[in-house]
Interface confidence: low
């Protein structure tokens, strides 16, 4: 039985040219995380964190994506095209797969506030 909950940074905003941390956290389960996949709104994979092999950043994002903190992902040099949904997929044993959603809005305004509260989707 899957008892866990994915908490995410929810809906966040950040300014163009800046950076943002995408963070998911798996709680309320003793399951062990074997792999975390990070996907963009068009379902293209940004990065993978494998328990054995460590981080793999996909070549198309190498210049703008940094691993961490933790199992999270840091997006840098944001553009307006980065606006949209991001998904974290946690592969765990023995529970199976958990999925979390984050919506990022990239703002032109220099006064854009970067909110990073944790939410349960």
């Amino acid at each position: 039985m899957m008892t866990g909950t994915i908490e995410t940074t929810g809906n966040i905003s950040a300014k163009k040219g800046g950076s943002v941390i995408l963070q998911c956290h798996l709680s309320s389960t003793m399951a062990q995380v074997t792999q975390v996949n990070w996907e963009q709104h068009d379902h293209s994979l940004l990065a993978i964190r494998n328990a054995e092999l460590g981080w793999h950043i996909y070549p198309a994002f190498k210049d703008r994506v940094a691993p961490g903190p933790g199992l999270g992902l840091t997006l840098q040099s944001l553009t307006m095209n980065d606006t949209g949904e991001y998904f974290c997929t946690y592969h765990t044993y023995p529970d199976g797969t958990y999925r979390g959603r984050i919506f990022l809005e990239v703002l032109e305004s220099s006064v854009a506030e970067h909110s990073a509260r944790f939410q349960i989707p």
Epitope: Q35, A51, E52, L53, H56
Partner: antibody, heavy 125, light 106 residues
Amino acid sequence: QVQLVQSGAEVKKPGASVKVSCKASGYTFTSYAIAWVRQAPGQGLEWMGWISAYNGNTNYAQKLQGRVTMTTDTSTSTAYMELRSLRSDDTAVYYCARSGSSFWSGDVLGAFDIWGQGTMVTVSS
Amino acid sequence: DIQMTQSPSSLSASVGDRVTITCRASQSISSYLNWYQQKPGKAPKLLIYAASSLQSGVPSRFSGSGSGTDFTLTISSLQPEDFATYYCQQSVPPRTFGGGTKVEIK
């Protein structure tokens, strides 16, 4: 064909160190992890740890922490296992093995699908 | 760490016999269970991965089943080359092996 070839047998004195090599061929070395497993004479198999050939990420068995170091040389597709402060109970055959998990499986299955031939390490005064 | 208990530790059988080896995990490991065969003086060989998947090149007389905590390796009709020691291994970090089952000629 896919294979792992290990260095030859070693005889060491207590307190010394040993470094065993494991050369991979026939597959993309950096797409997998290399695990090390040892087997004392007449005993079962003991997992020692692994190293990612992709980025050097390591995970060691708790009982060996501080005494073991695993490294890779991607230019020669070779993995190394160094064990320090050797004791008589470290006498064993040491195997390297390819861990079948990869980034593309979407999961850690982690079966050891390819094994080296083994390296006998004898620790004796 | 997860403990793996294999039984029996040894067994005697004849060519053509159906042989069953069991492996029990101290906690649920889903299907993260592999089986290996080892002959004297040789490296282990992977037979079954993910509890029931047959490794390429392994004869179909070998099969695996189970999930959670209880697993079974079955050899449907024992052949002369099957006399060896068999190990289960759970592949949840940190890896642990069962104690082994030696299959001997009766």
